[in-house]
Interface confidence: medium
Amino acid sequence: MVLEVSDHQVLNDAEVAALLENFSSSYDYGENESDSCCTSPPCPQDFSLNFDRAFLPALYSLLFLLGLLGNGAVAAVLLSRRTALSSTDTFLLHLAVADTLLVLTLPLWAVDAAVQWVFGSGLCKVAGALFNINFYAGALLLACISFDRYLNIVHATQLYRRGPPARVTLTCLAVWGLCLLFALPDFIFLSAHHDERLNATHCQYNFPQVGRTALRVLQLVAGFLLPLLVMAYCYAHILAVLLVSRGQRRLRAMRLVVVVVVAFALCWTPYHLVVLVDILMDLGALARNCGRESRVDVAKSVTSGLGYMHCCLNPLLYAFVGVKFRERMWMLLLRLGCPNQRGLQRQPSSSRRDSSWSETSEASYSGL
Protein backbone atom coordinates (compact mmCIF):
# COMPACT_ATOMS: atom_id res chain seq x y z
CA MET A 1 0.00 0.00 0.00
CA VAL A 2 2.67 2.46 0.95
CA LEU A 3 5.76 2.66 -1.19
CA GLU A 4 9.23 2.86 0.28
CA VAL A 5 12.36 4.88 -0.44
CA SER A 6 15.63 3.88 1.20
CA ASP A 7 18.97 5.60 1.67
CA HIS A 8 20.99 2.42 1.63
CA GLN A 9 21.86 2.09 -1.99
CA VAL A 10 21.59 3.07 -5.57
CA LEU A 11 20.12 -0.12 -6.89
CA ASN A 12 21.67 -2.42 -9.38
CA ASP A 13 19.90 -4.34 -12.14
CA ALA A 14 21.36 -7.68 -11.17
CA GLU A 15 20.11 -10.19 -8.65
CA VAL A 16 21.55 -10.45 -5.16
CA ALA A 17 24.34 -12.87 -6.04
CA ALA A 18 25.65 -10.64 -8.80
CA LEU A 19 25.16 -7.60 -6.61
CA LEU A 20 27.25 -9.02 -3.81
CA GLU A 21 29.99 -10.11 -6.22
CA ASN A 22 30.21 -6.79 -8.00
CA PHE A 23 29.53 -4.38 -5.18
CA SER A 24 32.27 -5.72 -2.95
CA SER A 25 34.90 -5.04 -5.56
CA SER A 26 33.59 -1.82 -7.02
CA TYR A 27 31.78 0.07 -4.30
CA ASP A 28 33.25 2.24 -1.62
CA TYR A 29 31.61 1.67 1.76
CA GLY A 30 31.99 3.48 5.03
CA GLU A 31 33.53 1.71 8.01
CA ASN A 32 30.33 0.17 9.31
CA GLU A 33 28.73 -0.53 5.96
CA SER A 34 28.84 -3.89 4.29
CA ASP A 35 27.82 -5.06 0.88
CA SER A 36 24.86 -6.85 2.41
CA CYS A 37 23.11 -3.52 2.09
CA CYS A 38 22.44 -3.93 -1.57
CA THR A 39 19.72 -6.44 -2.12
CA SER A 40 16.95 -5.01 -4.29
CA PRO A 41 16.94 -4.87 -8.07
CA PRO A 42 15.13 -2.00 -9.76
CA CYS A 43 12.61 -4.13 -11.60
CA PRO A 44 10.09 -2.62 -13.99
CA GLN A 45 6.83 -3.00 -12.08
CA ASP A 46 4.46 -2.38 -14.95
CA PHE A 47 2.55 -5.63 -14.43
CA SER A 48 2.07 -5.24 -10.68
CA LEU A 49 1.16 -1.57 -11.07
CA ASN A 50 -1.42 -2.34 -13.76
CA PHE A 51 -2.78 -5.12 -11.58
CA ASP A 52 -3.03 -2.71 -8.62
CA ARG A 53 -4.71 -0.13 -10.80
CA ALA A 54 -7.40 -2.59 -11.85
CA PHE A 55 -7.79 -4.64 -8.68
CA LEU A 56 -7.33 -2.36 -5.67
CA PRO A 57 -9.76 0.52 -6.34
CA ALA A 58 -12.69 -1.88 -6.84
CA LEU A 59 -11.77 -3.98 -3.81
CA TYR A 60 -11.14 -1.00 -1.54
CA SER A 61 -14.40 0.66 -2.56
CA LEU A 62 -16.35 -2.50 -1.77
CA LEU A 63 -14.55 -3.01 1.55
CA PHE A 64 -15.10 0.64 2.44
CA LEU A 65 -18.88 0.31 2.02
CA LEU A 66 -19.15 -3.09 3.72
CA GLY A 67 -16.79 -2.13 6.54
CA LEU A 68 -18.56 1.14 7.22
CA LEU A 69 -22.02 -0.46 7.26
CA GLY A 70 -21.01 -3.54 9.22
CA ASN A 71 -18.86 -1.89 11.86
CA GLY A 72 -21.31 0.98 12.12
CA ALA A 73 -24.01 -1.58 12.89
CA VAL A 74 -21.82 -3.24 15.55
CA ALA A 75 -21.04 0.09 17.19
CA ALA A 76 -24.72 1.09 17.06
CA VAL A 77 -25.84 -2.17 18.68
CA LEU A 78 -23.24 -1.89 21.43
CA LEU A 79 -23.84 1.77 22.14
CA SER A 80 -27.62 1.34 22.15
CA ARG A 81 -27.37 -0.71 25.36
CA ARG A 82 -28.70 1.12 28.39
CA THR A 83 -26.53 -0.82 30.80
CA ALA A 84 -22.75 -0.88 31.17
CA LEU A 85 -20.84 -2.85 28.56
CA SER A 86 -19.09 -6.06 29.53
CA SER A 87 -15.32 -6.19 29.07
CA THR A 88 -15.58 -8.22 25.86
CA ASP A 89 -18.24 -5.86 24.50
CA THR A 90 -15.97 -2.92 25.27
CA PHE A 91 -13.11 -4.55 23.40
CA LEU A 92 -15.47 -5.34 20.51
CA LEU A 93 -16.60 -1.71 20.43
CA HIS A 94 -12.97 -0.59 20.20
CA LEU A 95 -12.40 -3.25 17.54
CA ALA A 96 -15.32 -1.87 15.52
CA VAL A 97 -13.87 1.64 15.88
CA ALA A 98 -10.44 0.40 14.76
CA ASP A 99 -11.91 -1.41 11.76
CA THR A 100 -14.05 1.62 10.85
CA LEU A 101 -11.07 3.97 10.99
CA LEU A 102 -9.06 1.56 8.87
CA VAL A 103 -11.72 1.27 6.16
CA LEU A 104 -12.11 5.07 6.18
CA THR A 105 -8.59 5.30 4.73
CA LEU A 106 -9.34 2.82 1.92
CA PRO A 107 -10.86 5.36 -0.52
CA LEU A 108 -7.63 7.37 -0.29
CA TRP A 109 -5.54 4.30 -1.10
CA ALA A 110 -7.97 3.43 -3.89
CA VAL A 111 -7.31 6.82 -5.50
CA ASP A 112 -3.55 6.33 -4.93
CA ALA A 113 -3.66 2.97 -6.72
CA ALA A 114 -5.93 4.13 -9.53
CA VAL A 115 -4.35 7.49 -10.32
CA GLN A 116 -1.91 8.99 -7.84
CA TRP A 117 -1.78 10.51 -4.36
CA VAL A 118 -3.62 13.82 -4.69
CA PHE A 119 -4.13 14.56 -1.01
CA GLY A 120 -0.76 16.08 -0.04
CA SER A 121 1.92 15.03 2.46
CA GLY A 122 -0.13 15.88 5.57
CA LEU A 123 -2.96 13.52 4.71
CA CYS A 124 -0.42 10.96 3.49
CA LYS A 125 1.06 10.89 7.01
CA VAL A 126 -2.34 10.82 8.70
CA ALA A 127 -3.81 8.14 6.40
CA GLY A 128 -0.71 5.96 6.66
CA ALA A 129 -0.60 6.31 10.43
CA LEU A 130 -4.35 5.78 10.78
CA PHE A 131 -4.12 2.70 8.63
CA ASN A 132 -1.31 1.17 10.69
CA ILE A 133 -2.74 2.24 14.06
CA ASN A 134 -5.93 0.39 13.28
CA PHE A 135 -4.19 -2.59 11.71
CA TYR A 136 -2.28 -3.08 14.99
CA ALA A 137 -5.28 -2.19 17.15
CA GLY A 138 -7.45 -4.83 15.47
CA ALA A 139 -4.94 -7.57 16.17
CA LEU A 140 -4.12 -6.45 19.72
CA LEU A 141 -7.77 -6.02 20.72
CA LEU A 142 -8.52 -9.57 19.56
CA ALA A 143 -5.60 -10.69 21.72
CA CYS A 144 -7.08 -8.73 24.65
CA ILE A 145 -10.46 -10.43 24.18
CA SER A 146 -8.84 -13.85 24.22
CA PHE A 147 -6.79 -12.99 27.31
CA ASP A 148 -9.92 -11.73 29.07
CA ARG A 149 -11.74 -14.98 28.20
CA TYR A 150 -8.70 -16.98 29.35
CA LEU A 151 -8.59 -15.29 32.77
CA ASN A 152 -12.33 -15.53 33.09
CA ILE A 153 -12.65 -19.23 32.27
CA VAL A 154 -9.30 -20.89 32.94
CA HIS A 155 -8.47 -18.96 36.11
CA ALA A 156 -12.07 -18.04 36.98
CA THR A 157 -10.81 -14.47 37.33
CA GLN A 158 -12.80 -11.50 36.14
CA LEU A 159 -9.93 -9.09 35.65
CA TYR A 160 -12.33 -6.67 34.00
CA ARG A 161 -15.24 -6.86 36.47
CA ARG A 162 -18.32 -4.98 35.37
CA GLY A 163 -18.28 -2.72 38.44
CA PRO A 164 -15.34 -0.40 37.87
CA PRO A 165 -14.68 -0.26 34.07
CA ALA A 166 -11.29 1.36 34.70
CA ARG A 167 -9.22 -1.72 33.93
CA VAL A 168 -10.77 -2.40 30.54
CA THR A 169 -10.59 1.31 29.68
CA LEU A 170 -6.94 1.41 30.71
CA THR A 171 -6.22 -1.70 28.65
CA CYS A 172 -7.88 -0.14 25.60
CA LEU A 173 -5.98 3.09 26.16
CA ALA A 174 -2.74 1.10 26.44
CA VAL A 175 -3.55 -0.67 23.17
CA TRP A 176 -4.23 2.62 21.37
CA GLY A 177 -1.10 4.16 22.90
CA LEU A 178 1.01 1.25 21.75
CA CYS A 179 -0.51 1.50 18.28
CA LEU A 180 0.26 5.23 18.16
CA LEU A 181 3.84 4.37 19.08
CA PHE A 182 3.98 1.79 16.27
CA ALA A 183 2.63 4.43 13.87
CA LEU A 184 5.31 7.02 14.72
CA PRO A 185 7.41 6.05 11.67
CA ASP A 186 4.39 6.87 9.50
CA PHE A 187 4.10 10.37 10.93
CA ILE A 188 7.85 10.91 10.55
CA PHE A 189 8.78 9.16 7.30
CA LEU A 190 5.67 9.16 5.12
CA SER A 191 5.29 11.88 2.53
CA ALA A 192 3.75 12.52 -0.87
CA HIS A 193 6.61 11.82 -3.25
CA HIS A 194 6.67 12.58 -6.98
CA ASP A 195 7.77 9.61 -9.05
CA GLU A 196 9.38 10.95 -12.22
CA ARG A 197 9.23 7.70 -14.16
CA LEU A 198 5.51 7.24 -13.54
CA ASN A 199 4.98 11.00 -13.70
CA ALA A 200 2.76 10.54 -10.65
CA THR A 201 2.82 11.32 -6.94
CA HIS A 202 2.52 8.53 -4.39
CA CYS A 203 2.40 8.29 -0.62
CA GLN A 204 5.82 6.80 0.14
CA TYR A 205 8.18 6.02 2.97
CA ASN A 206 11.51 7.79 2.91
CA PHE A 207 13.83 6.10 5.38
CA PRO A 208 16.87 3.81 5.58
CA GLN A 209 16.64 0.20 4.44
CA VAL A 210 17.34 -1.08 7.95
CA GLY A 211 14.28 0.90 9.10
CA ARG A 212 12.15 -0.53 6.33
CA THR A 213 13.06 -4.09 7.30
CA ALA A 214 12.66 -3.35 11.02
CA LEU A 215 9.19 -1.91 10.42
CA ARG A 216 8.16 -4.98 8.46
CA VAL A 217 9.47 -7.27 11.21
CA LEU A 218 7.58 -5.19 13.80
CA GLN A 219 4.40 -5.45 11.74
CA LEU A 220 4.86 -9.20 11.41
CA VAL A 221 5.61 -9.78 15.10
CA ALA A 222 3.47 -7.18 16.92
CA GLY A 223 0.62 -7.07 14.43
CA PHE A 224 0.31 -10.77 13.71
CA LEU A 225 2.53 -13.38 15.37
CA LEU A 226 2.23 -12.10 18.95
CA PRO A 227 -1.57 -11.60 18.88
CA LEU A 228 -2.00 -14.94 17.12
CA LEU A 229 0.17 -16.72 19.70
CA VAL A 230 -1.77 -15.10 22.55
CA MET A 231 -5.06 -16.10 20.93
CA ALA A 232 -3.90 -19.65 20.22
CA TYR A 233 -2.54 -20.10 23.75
CA CYS A 234 -5.62 -18.66 25.45
CA TYR A 235 -8.20 -20.50 23.38
CA ALA A 236 -6.33 -23.79 23.53
CA HIS A 237 -6.44 -23.58 27.34
CA ILE A 238 -10.06 -22.41 27.34
CA LEU A 239 -11.17 -25.28 25.12
CA ALA A 240 -9.23 -27.74 27.27
CA VAL A 241 -10.98 -26.47 30.42
CA LEU A 242 -14.41 -26.50 28.78
CA LEU A 243 -13.94 -30.00 27.39
CA VAL A 244 -12.86 -31.29 30.79
CA SER A 245 -15.84 -29.62 32.50
CA ARG A 246 -18.14 -30.90 29.73
CA GLY A 247 -19.69 -27.45 29.52
CA GLN A 248 -21.65 -27.85 26.30
CA ARG A 249 -23.37 -24.49 26.71
CA ARG A 250 -20.03 -22.85 27.27
CA LEU A 251 -18.55 -24.64 24.27
CA ARG A 252 -21.40 -23.36 22.13
CA ALA A 253 -20.78 -19.93 23.56
CA MET A 254 -17.14 -20.18 22.52
CA ARG A 255 -18.15 -20.65 18.90
CA LEU A 256 -18.06 -16.99 17.93
CA VAL A 257 -14.72 -16.12 19.51
CA VAL A 258 -13.13 -19.19 17.93
CA VAL A 259 -14.61 -18.24 14.55
CA VAL A 260 -13.37 -14.63 14.99
CA VAL A 261 -9.84 -15.85 15.77
CA VAL A 262 -9.84 -18.36 12.91
CA ALA A 263 -11.04 -15.58 10.60
CA PHE A 264 -8.19 -13.36 11.80
CA ALA A 265 -5.67 -16.13 11.13
CA LEU A 266 -7.12 -17.02 7.72
CA CYS A 267 -7.35 -13.40 6.60
CA TRP A 268 -3.93 -12.22 7.72
CA THR A 269 -1.68 -15.31 7.43
CA PRO A 270 -1.30 -15.12 3.61
CA TYR A 271 -0.31 -11.44 3.75
CA HIS A 272 2.24 -11.97 6.48
CA LEU A 273 3.74 -14.94 4.65
CA VAL A 274 4.26 -12.64 1.66
CA VAL A 275 5.74 -9.98 3.97
CA LEU A 276 8.04 -12.67 5.37
CA VAL A 277 9.23 -13.48 1.84
CA ASP A 278 9.81 -9.75 1.29
CA ILE A 279 11.80 -9.50 4.55
CA LEU A 280 13.91 -12.50 3.53
CA MET A 281 14.59 -10.83 0.17
CA ASP A 282 15.52 -7.58 1.97
CA LEU A 283 17.93 -9.48 4.18
CA GLY A 284 19.39 -11.37 1.23
CA ALA A 285 18.30 -14.76 2.55
CA LEU A 286 16.20 -15.17 -0.61
CA ALA A 287 17.58 -14.14 -3.97
CA ARG A 288 15.65 -11.20 -5.37
CA ASN A 289 14.86 -11.23 -9.06
CA CYS A 290 12.41 -9.36 -11.21
CA GLY A 291 10.03 -12.27 -11.68
CA ARG A 292 9.90 -12.95 -7.96
CA GLU A 293 9.62 -9.25 -7.13
CA SER A 294 6.67 -8.86 -9.49
CA ARG A 295 4.97 -11.96 -8.04
CA VAL A 296 5.55 -10.69 -4.50
CA ASP A 297 4.09 -7.27 -5.39
CA VAL A 298 0.95 -8.85 -6.86
CA ALA A 299 0.71 -11.33 -3.97
CA LYS A 300 1.02 -8.43 -1.53
CA SER A 301 -1.87 -6.63 -3.21
CA VAL A 302 -4.10 -9.72 -3.23
CA THR A 303 -3.26 -10.86 0.30
CA SER A 304 -3.47 -7.36 1.80
CA GLY A 305 -6.91 -7.12 0.20
CA LEU A 306 -7.80 -10.38 1.95
CA GLY A 307 -6.45 -8.92 5.18
CA TYR A 308 -8.53 -5.76 4.90
CA MET A 309 -11.54 -8.00 4.30
CA HIS A 310 -11.15 -8.95 7.95
CA CYS A 311 -12.40 -5.47 8.85
CA CYS A 312 -15.74 -6.30 7.24
CA LEU A 313 -15.82 -9.90 8.37
CA ASN A 314 -16.31 -9.44 12.13
CA PRO A 315 -19.76 -7.82 11.80
CA LEU A 316 -20.83 -10.59 9.41
CA LEU A 317 -19.59 -13.21 11.85
CA TYR A 318 -21.53 -11.61 14.69
CA ALA A 319 -24.60 -11.52 12.46
CA PHE A 320 -24.43 -15.13 11.31
CA VAL A 321 -22.83 -16.85 14.29
CA GLY A 322 -23.96 -14.60 17.14
CA VAL A 323 -27.66 -15.12 17.84
CA LYS A 324 -27.69 -12.38 20.45
CA PHE A 325 -26.24 -9.83 18.03
CA ARG A 326 -29.01 -10.59 15.55
CA GLU A 327 -31.59 -10.06 18.27
CA ARG A 328 -30.02 -6.76 19.34
CA MET A 329 -29.76 -5.61 15.73
CA TRP A 330 -33.40 -6.50 15.10
CA MET A 331 -34.47 -4.63 18.22
CA LEU A 332 -32.45 -1.59 17.25
CA LEU A 333 -33.96 -1.56 13.74
CA LEU A 334 -37.43 -1.90 15.21
CA ARG A 335 -36.76 0.95 17.58
CA LEU A 336 -35.42 3.14 14.78
CA GLY A 337 -38.25 2.22 12.45
CA CYS A 338 -41.12 2.23 14.96
CA PRO A 339 -40.34 4.71 17.75
CA ASN A 340 -43.85 4.43 19.25
CA GLN A 341 -43.90 0.65 19.52
CA ARG A 342 -41.15 0.07 22.07
CA GLY A 343 -43.54 -1.76 24.35
CA LEU A 344 -44.30 -4.27 21.63
CA GLN A 345 -40.67 -5.34 21.09
CA ARG A 346 -40.04 -9.03 21.57
CA GLN A 347 -37.61 -9.49 24.44
CA PRO A 348 -34.78 -11.93 23.82
CA SER A 349 -35.10 -15.31 25.49
CA SER A 350 -32.03 -14.63 27.63
CA SER A 351 -33.43 -11.36 29.01
CA ARG A 352 -32.07 -12.04 32.47
CA ARG A 353 -28.68 -11.17 31.00
CA ASP A 354 -29.98 -8.44 28.75
CA SER A 355 -26.98 -6.22 29.35
CA SER A 356 -24.60 -7.98 27.01
CA TRP A 357 -24.41 -10.04 23.85
CA SER A 358 -20.93 -11.27 24.72
CA GLU A 359 -21.45 -11.92 28.41
CA THR A 360 -18.27 -11.76 30.49
CA SER A 361 -19.62 -13.95 33.25
CA GLU A 362 -20.33 -16.67 30.72
CA ALA A 363 -17.82 -18.36 28.47
CA SER A 364 -18.56 -15.72 25.87
CA TYR A 365 -21.35 -14.50 23.62
CA SER A 366 -23.88 -16.17 25.90
CA GLY A 367 -26.89 -16.13 23.64
CA LEU A 368 -25.38 -18.48 21.08
Epitope: D7, Q9, N12, P42
Partner: antibody, heavy 123, light 106 residues
Framework: EVQLLESGGGLVQPGGSLRLSCAAS????????MSWVRQAPGKGLEWVAT????????YYPDSVKGRFTISRDNAKNTLYLQMNSLRAEDTAMYYC????????????????WGQGTLVTVSS | DIQLTQSPSFLSASVGDRVTITCRAS?????IYWYQQKPGKAPKLWIY???NLAPGVPSRFSGSGSGNEYTLTISSLQPEDFATYYC?????????FGQGTKLEIK
Protein backbone atom coordinates in the same frame (compact mmCIF):
# COMPACT_ATOMS: atom_id res chain seq x y z
CA GLU B 1 11.07 22.29 -13.63
CA VAL B 2 14.10 20.18 -12.71
CA GLN B 3 17.34 22.12 -13.08
CA LEU B 4 20.95 21.09 -12.42
CA LEU B 5 23.64 23.73 -12.73
CA GLU B 6 27.29 22.71 -12.57
CA SER B 7 30.14 25.07 -11.71
CA GLY B 8 33.78 24.98 -10.58
CA GLY B 9 35.40 23.70 -13.76
CA GLY B 10 38.54 25.21 -15.22
CA LEU B 11 42.19 24.68 -16.09
CA VAL B 12 44.29 22.81 -13.56
CA GLN B 13 47.77 21.32 -13.62
CA PRO B 14 48.39 17.55 -13.34
CA GLY B 15 48.44 16.57 -9.68
CA GLY B 16 46.24 19.53 -8.79
CA SER B 17 42.81 19.63 -7.20
CA LEU B 18 39.44 21.03 -8.14
CA ARG B 19 36.01 21.07 -6.54
CA LEU B 20 32.93 20.93 -8.72
CA SER B 21 29.50 21.99 -7.51
CA CYS B 22 26.04 21.23 -8.82
CA ALA B 23 23.12 23.38 -7.65
CA ALA B 24 19.81 21.56 -7.87
CA SER B 25 16.34 23.07 -8.05
CA UNK B 26 12.81 22.16 -9.11
CA UNK B 27 12.63 18.89 -7.16
CA UNK B 28 13.07 17.51 -3.64
CA UNK B 29 16.85 17.16 -3.70
CA UNK B 30 16.94 15.23 -0.40
CA UNK B 31 14.96 12.38 -1.95
CA UNK B 32 17.22 11.61 -4.89
CA UNK B 33 20.52 9.83 -5.42
CA MET B 34 22.88 11.89 -7.56
CA SER B 35 25.84 11.14 -9.80
CA TRP B 36 28.66 12.70 -11.77
CA VAL B 37 29.24 11.55 -15.33
CA ARG B 38 32.03 12.84 -17.55
CA GLN B 39 32.70 13.05 -21.25
CA ALA B 40 36.19 13.54 -22.66
CA PRO B 41 36.28 15.83 -25.73
CA GLY B 42 34.93 13.94 -28.74
CA LYS B 43 34.57 10.76 -26.68
CA GLY B 44 31.81 8.79 -24.97
CA LEU B 45 30.27 9.03 -21.53
CA GLU B 46 31.88 7.67 -18.35
CA TRP B 47 30.27 7.25 -14.95
CA VAL B 48 32.39 8.88 -12.23
CA ALA B 49 30.62 8.76 -8.86
CA THR B 50 27.24 8.30 -7.17
CA UNK B 51 25.87 9.28 -3.76
CA UNK B 52 22.70 8.05 -2.05
CA UNK B 53 20.00 10.57 -1.17
CA UNK B 54 21.03 10.88 2.47
CA UNK B 55 24.71 10.91 1.63
CA UNK B 56 25.42 7.69 3.54
CA UNK B 57 26.63 5.65 0.59
CA UNK B 58 29.07 6.61 -2.12
CA TYR B 59 30.02 4.63 -5.20
CA TYR B 60 33.02 5.00 -7.54
CA PRO B 61 34.57 3.15 -10.47
CA ASP B 62 38.17 1.98 -9.94
CA SER B 63 39.46 4.71 -12.30
CA VAL B 64 38.71 7.49 -9.80
CA LYS B 65 38.50 5.67 -6.47
CA GLY B 66 40.77 7.23 -3.87
CA ARG B 67 41.21 10.42 -5.90
CA PHE B 68 37.64 11.71 -6.25
CA THR B 69 35.13 12.25 -3.46
CA ILE B 70 31.42 12.83 -4.03
CA SER B 71 29.45 14.61 -1.31
CA ARG B 72 26.27 16.59 -0.90
CA ASP B 73 24.83 19.35 1.25
CA ASN B 74 21.10 18.67 1.40
CA ALA B 75 20.47 21.92 3.25
CA LYS B 76 21.91 23.83 0.28
CA ASN B 77 20.54 21.48 -2.42
CA THR B 78 24.07 21.11 -3.72
CA LEU B 79 26.13 18.18 -4.96
CA TYR B 80 29.95 18.28 -4.92
CA LEU B 81 32.83 16.43 -6.54
CA GLN B 82 36.23 16.92 -4.95
CA MET B 83 38.90 15.91 -7.46
CA ASN B 84 42.46 15.39 -6.24
CA SER B 85 45.63 14.11 -7.97
CA LEU B 86 44.21 15.12 -11.32
CA ARG B 87 45.61 13.55 -14.49
CA ALA B 88 45.50 14.54 -18.14
CA GLU B 89 42.97 11.76 -18.78
CA ASP B 90 40.55 13.44 -16.35
CA THR B 91 40.08 16.25 -18.89
CA ALA B 92 36.38 16.18 -19.71
CA MET B 93 33.03 17.85 -19.49
CA TYR B 94 31.61 16.87 -16.08
CA TYR B 95 27.87 16.44 -15.85
CA CYS B 96 25.81 16.25 -12.70
CA UNK B 97 22.90 13.80 -13.12
CA UNK B 98 19.93 12.66 -11.10
CA UNK B 99 18.80 9.10 -10.52
CA UNK B 100 15.06 8.60 -10.75
CA UNK B 101 13.11 6.83 -8.03
CA UNK B 102 10.54 4.28 -9.07
CA UNK B 103 8.36 2.48 -6.51
CA UNK B 104 10.74 3.42 -3.76
CA UNK B 105 13.87 2.17 -5.50
CA UNK B 106 16.74 4.17 -6.93
CA UNK B 107 17.35 3.44 -10.57
CA UNK B 108 20.78 3.22 -12.14
CA UNK B 109 20.03 5.37 -15.14
CA UNK B 110 19.88 9.16 -15.19
CA UNK B 111 16.68 11.03 -15.88
CA UNK B 112 17.98 14.62 -15.68
CA TRP B 113 21.38 16.04 -16.55
CA GLY B 114 22.98 19.42 -16.05
CA GLN B 115 24.66 21.29 -18.93
CA GLY B 116 28.11 20.36 -17.63
CA THR B 117 31.29 22.14 -16.54
CA LEU B 118 34.57 21.70 -18.40
CA VAL B 119 37.66 20.50 -16.54
CA THR B 120 40.98 20.75 -18.36
CA VAL B 121 44.06 19.09 -16.83
CA SER B 122 47.15 20.37 -18.58
CA SER B 123 50.59 21.68 -17.79
CA ASP C 1 33.94 -4.76 -16.47
CA ILE C 2 31.06 -5.15 -18.91
CA GLN C 3 31.98 -3.63 -22.27
CA LEU C 4 29.19 -2.20 -24.40
CA THR C 5 29.86 -2.06 -28.12
CA GLN C 6 27.54 -0.05 -30.32
CA SER C 7 27.24 -0.66 -34.01
CA PRO C 8 27.52 1.11 -36.26
CA SER C 9 29.60 3.93 -34.77
CA PHE C 10 28.48 6.22 -37.58
CA LEU C 11 25.29 5.96 -39.54
CA SER C 12 24.21 8.08 -42.47
CA ALA C 13 20.51 7.94 -43.21
CA SER C 14 17.74 9.96 -44.82
CA VAL C 15 14.52 11.34 -43.40
CA GLY C 16 11.87 8.62 -43.48
CA ASP C 17 14.38 5.76 -43.23
CA ARG C 18 14.01 2.93 -40.75
CA VAL C 19 17.13 2.85 -38.59
CA THR C 20 18.42 0.26 -36.12
CA ILE C 21 21.28 0.77 -33.67
CA THR C 22 22.68 -2.26 -31.87
CA CYS C 23 24.30 -2.41 -28.44
CA ARG C 24 26.21 -5.61 -27.60
CA ALA C 25 27.31 -6.42 -24.07
CA SER C 26 30.46 -8.45 -23.35
CA UNK C 27 28.39 -10.39 -20.81
CA UNK C 28 24.67 -10.57 -20.15
CA UNK C 29 22.90 -7.52 -18.75
CA UNK C 30 19.40 -7.17 -17.28
CA UNK C 31 18.40 -3.94 -19.01
CA ILE C 32 19.82 -1.36 -21.36
CA TYR C 33 19.19 2.38 -21.18
CA TRP C 34 19.53 4.70 -24.15
CA TYR C 35 20.42 8.40 -24.18
CA GLN C 36 20.27 10.95 -26.98
CA GLN C 37 22.89 13.71 -27.14
CA LYS C 38 23.03 16.62 -29.52
CA PRO C 39 26.24 18.64 -30.11
CA GLY C 40 27.07 21.00 -27.23
CA LYS C 41 24.15 19.68 -25.16
CA ALA C 42 23.80 17.35 -22.20
CA PRO C 43 22.56 13.81 -22.85
CA LYS C 44 18.84 13.12 -22.44
CA LEU C 45 17.27 9.91 -21.21
CA TRP C 46 15.62 8.34 -24.23
CA ILE C 47 14.72 4.73 -23.39
CA TYR C 48 14.79 3.05 -19.97
CA UNK C 49 14.41 -0.59 -18.93
CA UNK C 50 15.24 -1.69 -22.49
CA UNK C 51 11.90 -0.75 -24.05
CA ASN C 52 10.20 2.07 -22.12
CA LEU C 53 10.20 5.45 -23.83
CA ALA C 54 11.12 8.40 -21.62
CA PRO C 55 8.50 11.18 -21.36
CA GLY C 56 8.35 13.24 -24.55
CA VAL C 57 10.09 10.66 -26.73
CA PRO C 58 8.14 10.08 -29.97
CA SER C 59 6.51 6.68 -30.52
CA ARG C 60 8.57 6.10 -33.66
CA PHE C 61 11.38 5.09 -31.27
CA SER C 62 11.40 1.62 -29.81
CA GLY C 63 13.80 -0.52 -27.84
CA SER C 64 14.16 -4.25 -27.51
CA GLY C 65 16.59 -7.03 -26.71
CA SER C 66 17.78 -9.22 -23.88
CA GLY C 67 20.94 -10.82 -22.56
CA ASN C 68 23.84 -9.63 -24.69
CA GLU C 69 22.14 -7.85 -27.58
CA TYR C 70 19.87 -4.82 -27.50
CA THR C 71 18.55 -2.56 -30.22
CA LEU C 72 17.16 0.94 -30.60
CA THR C 73 14.93 1.33 -33.65
CA ILE C 74 13.57 4.46 -35.31
CA SER C 75 10.70 3.48 -37.61
CA SER C 76 10.71 6.66 -39.69
CA LEU C 77 13.65 9.02 -39.23
CA GLN C 78 12.80 12.68 -38.66
CA PRO C 79 15.18 15.71 -38.92
CA GLU C 80 15.22 16.15 -35.11
CA ASP C 81 16.41 12.55 -34.61
CA PHE C 82 19.90 13.24 -35.96
CA ALA C 83 22.12 13.04 -32.88
CA THR C 84 24.45 10.67 -31.04
CA TYR C 85 22.87 7.77 -29.16
CA TYR C 86 24.50 6.04 -26.19
CA CYS C 87 23.53 2.81 -24.49
CA UNK C 88 24.25 2.21 -20.79
CA UNK C 89 24.16 -0.82 -18.49
CA UNK C 90 23.56 -0.83 -14.77
CA UNK C 91 23.92 -4.54 -14.13
CA UNK C 92 27.48 -4.58 -12.96
CA UNK C 93 29.79 -1.91 -11.60
CA UNK C 94 31.41 0.08 -13.10
CA UNK C 95 28.31 1.25 -14.92
CA UNK C 96 29.45 1.56 -18.48
CA PHE C 97 28.22 3.33 -21.59
CA GLY C 98 28.64 2.32 -25.21
CA GLN C 99 31.01 4.42 -27.33
CA GLY C 100 28.03 6.03 -29.06
CA THR C 101 26.40 5.91 -32.49
CA LYS C 102 26.40 9.16 -34.43
CA LEU C 103 23.38 9.42 -36.69
CA GLU C 104 24.02 11.80 -39.58
CA ILE C 105 21.92 13.13 -42.45
CA LYS C 106 22.82 11.46 -45.73
Amino acid sequence: EVQLLESGGGLVQPGGSLRLSCAASGFTFTSYAMSWVRQAPGKGLEWVATISHGGTYTYYPDSVKGRFTISRDNAKNTLYLQMNSLRAEDTAMYYCARHPIYSGNYQGYFDYWGQGTLVTVSS
Amino acid sequence: DIQLTQSPSFLSASVGDRVTITCRASSGVNYIYWYQQKPGKAPKLWIYFTSNLAPGVPSRFSGSGSGNEYTLTISSLQPEDFATYYCQQFTSSPYTFGQGTKLEIK
